[in-house]
């Protein structure tokens, strides 16, 4: 079985203020077996922006189930953007462990950028 | 108009690597921010994507066939590349590269991960010693 | 990944009627993430419908698309002689993107 890989295809994407971002991020393999968490920025200043474990992020939908259990996609829509929310996503595989879940693997991260609302 | 059309051996070896060539015609491939696909048929068969990658160099793969597909992209000859390693006689299908008219690089794009609407016409190779 | 069960496998109709053909997915799908395809013997399969219901550039009016969730239908509203063939859905709003097995439309 190859190591499970962590796709983030786009870069970088550009969305108008006030609209939703779409964010894709997909495994290549269901194991190991743990939950996925989506970051903003790297480092011990990231800031969690879902975490499909636990958690309300009201402005966080999924675009696929990510309740079901052969789901190797885990890519987000984030509503609503404003300004404050540029920065690089990374989408992060954990490790199931005890006490703690342990990070596995990142994506390559995508750059959101965010264009003034059209007038 | 933009045309896709498929090119490479038709016969390859158990074992051996399969390479195909998709040359686009009619507009640059790097014009957009279209991603690029290649979908294989086996004969009196359904479809089954195999991977899809952007001009600038981004792939996904289908994960029952990763570890053995590589598609690249040069953007200098306007084409886009399929190699297939480790073929078996089940690897003996039609090949088809296509374009995913879908912007990804706009956020507000919606996600998801590929549909079709050009294709080419389609290159059989058989697997066979 | 998502499984999408094509029905009925063969479809015998003749020209001038109705045809109508079903996509059930495995899992939820939205329906921007639902797509159907005409292909005919020895040719590339051509892109009918997007979205679940948009039809692409160039596409007669007879095709429409409907459904949402697990169930979608392509409805050809009156088969003309050049619409027997295969016809294959396709979603990807799941990853990996996933391909029907087919129905087949024939001359009865």
């Known amino acids: 079985e190859d190591e499970l890989q962590v796709i983030q295809p786009e870069k970088s994407v550009s969305v108008a203020a006030g609209e939703s971002a779409t964010l894709r991020c997909a495994m290549t393999s269901l194991i190991p077996v743990g939950p996925i968490m989506w970051f903003r920025g790297a480092g011990a200043g990231r800031e969690l922006i879902y975490n499909q474990k636990e958690g309300h992020f009201p402005r966080v939908t999924t675009v696929s189930e990510l309740t079901k259990r052969n789901n190797l996609d885990f890519s987000i829509s984030i509503s609503n953007i404003t300004p404050a929310d540029a920065g690089t996503y990374y989408c992060v595989k954990f490790r199931k462990g005890s006490p703690d879940d342990v990070e596995f693997k990142s994506g390559a991260g995508t750059e959101l950028s965010v264009r003034a609302k059209p007038s | 108009q933009l045309q896709l059309q498929e090119s490479g051996p038709g016969l390859v070896k158990p074992s051996e690597t399969l390479s195909l060539t998709c040359t686009v015609s009619?507009?640059?491939?790097?014009?957009?921010?279209?991603?690029w696909g290649w979908i294989r048929q086996p004969p009196g068969k359904g479809l089954e994507w195999i991977g899809s990658?952007?001009?600038?160099?981004?792939?996904y793969y289908n994960p029952s066939l990763k570890s053995r597909v590589t598609i690249s992209v040069d953007t200098s000859k306007n084409q886009f590349s399929l190699k297939l390693s480790s073929v078996t006689a089940a690897d003996t299908a039609v090949y088809y590269c296509a374009r995913d008219p879908r912007d990804y690089s706009s956020g507000s794009s919606g996600g998801g991960w590929g549909y079709f609407d050009l294709w080419g016409r389609g290159t059989l190779v058989t697997v066979s010693s | 990944e998502i499984v999408l069960t094509q029905s009925p496998g063969t479809l015998s109709l003749s020209p001038g009627e109705r045809a109508t053909l079903s996509c059930r997915a495995s899992q939820s799908v939205s329906s921007s993430y639902l797509a159907w395809y005409q292909q005919k013997p020895g040719q590339a399969p051509r892109l009918l419908i997007y979205g679940a219901s948009s039809r692409a550039t160039g596409i007669p009016d007879r095709f429409s698309g409907s459904g949402s969730g697990t169930d979608f239908t392509l409805t050809i509203s009156r088969l003309e002689p050049e619409d027997f063939a295969v016809y294959y859905c396709q979603q990807d709003g799941n990853f990996p993107l996933t391909f029907g097995g087919g129905t087949k439309v024939e001359i009865k």
């Open positions: 990658i952007s001009y600038s160099g981004s792939t």
């Open positions: 009619g507009g640059s491939i790097s014009s957009s921010s279209y991603y």
